[in-house]
């Protein structure tokens, strides 16, 4: 009864430091409450980037100071991470938990490698 | 007596559209004349990007209108491709041929995925 989580292998952040990707899960049950967590793995260290719990059919709400935003549609979550710099390049892993109703399910994607290139500064305007 | 050619799996072009990578070959013989070709594979189409023949110990010379430049050091070739745009993202394959003296050897790398992000235009200076 494993829950499969799929996400793209590679995504490029745009020149404004914004990267978007879809995290899709195959739900073994009829979940009404879902928790999505984005983790970053770099140099064998895993850190939480952001997390949101949402009710199926409702909007995905991250904390106000979160660098993530997202929308949900059925078993798909469209995630956007902003404010990225070149040093944030790394593997971004999507974890999905079906919180309610029981039983609990969890699935972890293989990760999306997000590449970020810092833009050249614009020349000063005289 | 196959000739192994190594190149990095992934390289990011900088914000000026310049990407550099090393193409290294394990020479089965004592070559004096070497030819290096860079090919781009995208949508199962392979096209030649640039090519240069050089004498061992001498400079690597591409044609004047080539988007490639490079230097050689022993069995390593340092390649730089410039003028890249987002649409040029693709797999860049390094092919090395030992032209002289006989026997002829050829080796092809697994390719370097070059990612290119177009920069945001700078605001007009009034």
């Amino acid at each position: 009864k494993a829950m499969h989580v799929a996400q793209p292998a590679v995504v490029l952040a745009n020149s404004r430091g914004i990267a978007s990707f879809v995290c899709e899960y195959a739900s073994p049950g009829k979940a009404t409450e879902v928790r999505v967590t984005v983790l970053r793995q770099a140099d064998s260290q895993v850190t939480e980037v952001c997390a949101a719990t949402y009710m199926m059919g409702n909007e995905l709400t991250f904390l106000d100071d979160s660098i993530c935003t997202g929308t949900s549609s059925g078993n798909q979550v469209n995630l956007t991470i902003q404010g990225l710099r070149a040093m944030d390049t790394g593997l971004y892993i999507c974890k999905v938990e079906l919180m309610y109703p029981p039983p609990y399910y969890m699935g972890i994607g293989n990760g999306t490698q997000i590449y970020v290139i810092d833009p050249e500064p614009c020349p000063d305007s005289d | 007596k196959a000739m192994h050619v190594a190149q990095p799996a992934v390289v990011l072009a900088n914000s000026r559209g310049i990407a550099s990578f090393v193409c290294e070959y394990a020479s089965p013989g004592k070559a004096t004349e070497v030819r290096v070709t860079v090919l781009r594979q995208a949508d199962s189409q392979v096209t030649e990007v640039c090519a240069a023949t050089y004498m061992m110990g001498n400079e690597l010379t591409f044609l004047d209108d080539s988007i490639c430049t490079g230097t050689s050091s022993g069995n390593q070739v340092n390649l730089t491709i410039q003028g890249l745009r987002a649409m040029d993202t693709g797999l860049y394959i390094c092919k090395v041929e030992l032209m002289y003296p006989p026997p002829y050897y050829m080796g092809i790398g697994n390719g370097t995925q070059i990612y290119v992000i177009d920069p945001e235009p700078c605001p007009d200076s009034d």
Partner: antibody
Framework: QVQLVESGGGVVQPGRSLRLSCAAS????????MHWVRQAPGKGLEWVAV????????YYADSVKGRFTISRDNSKNTLYLQMNSLRAEDAAVYYC??????????????WGQGTTVTVSS | EIVLTQSPGTLSLSPGERATLSCRAS???????LAWYQQKPGQAPRLLIY???SRATGIPDRFSGSGSGTDFTLTISRLEPEDFAVYYC?????????FGQGTKLEIK
Amino acid sequence: QVQLVESGGGVVQPGRSLRLSCAASGLTFSYYGMHWVRQAPGKGLEWVAVISYDGSNKYYADSVKGRFTISRDNSKNTLYLQMNSLRAEDAAVYYCAKDLGGDDYYGMDVWGQGTTVTVSS
Amino acid sequence: EIVLTQSPGTLSLSPGERATLSCRASQSVSRTYLAWYQQKPGQAPRLLIYGAFSRATGIPDRFSGSGSGTDFTLTISRLEPEDFAVYYCQQYGSSPYTFGQGTKLEIK
């Protein structure tokens, strides 16, 4: 608070049977998969068996397959391990443990204190 | 069955140091199905990490997990006196749900 209490351990002769019980309290027992894990004196942990939240799926370690049976009674909040044809190598402390999941298993987050089974002639 | 091999067998460190414990699987295990436990003498095991890197409730953030495929790591960033114990990894990728043989973390 959440509690698991094992009972039924004791001294038994090789070839005989024993039934272990695990009483759960402080949780909705019927939501969770349940495991038995054992540990021989001075040895590491050995996973024995698991049963899904509704009792529909059961899995066993190769060393106990065909001899041990895991079961549960959700109306009594109790997990069981029926051990037949006991061998000397079955002697261990037996722990029952609750899984985070119900029929897909991720980790045992609540453990009992263990009950000791001694197999000796 | 999937065999989990933990290394080192014994790790001797001092409080305040960083501990890195390894768990290697004989075949690939999904990150979802890798857990770590701590056991002290005379006590039942305690779940530390599940899903390769998710900390269980009440586990301090000095404990972290990482890895994928066949190689997983438990890191304790700064050892406290109460961290000296035996640590086990376990896989739930395929039945039987095997444990590693354990790593004993002892005071140097």
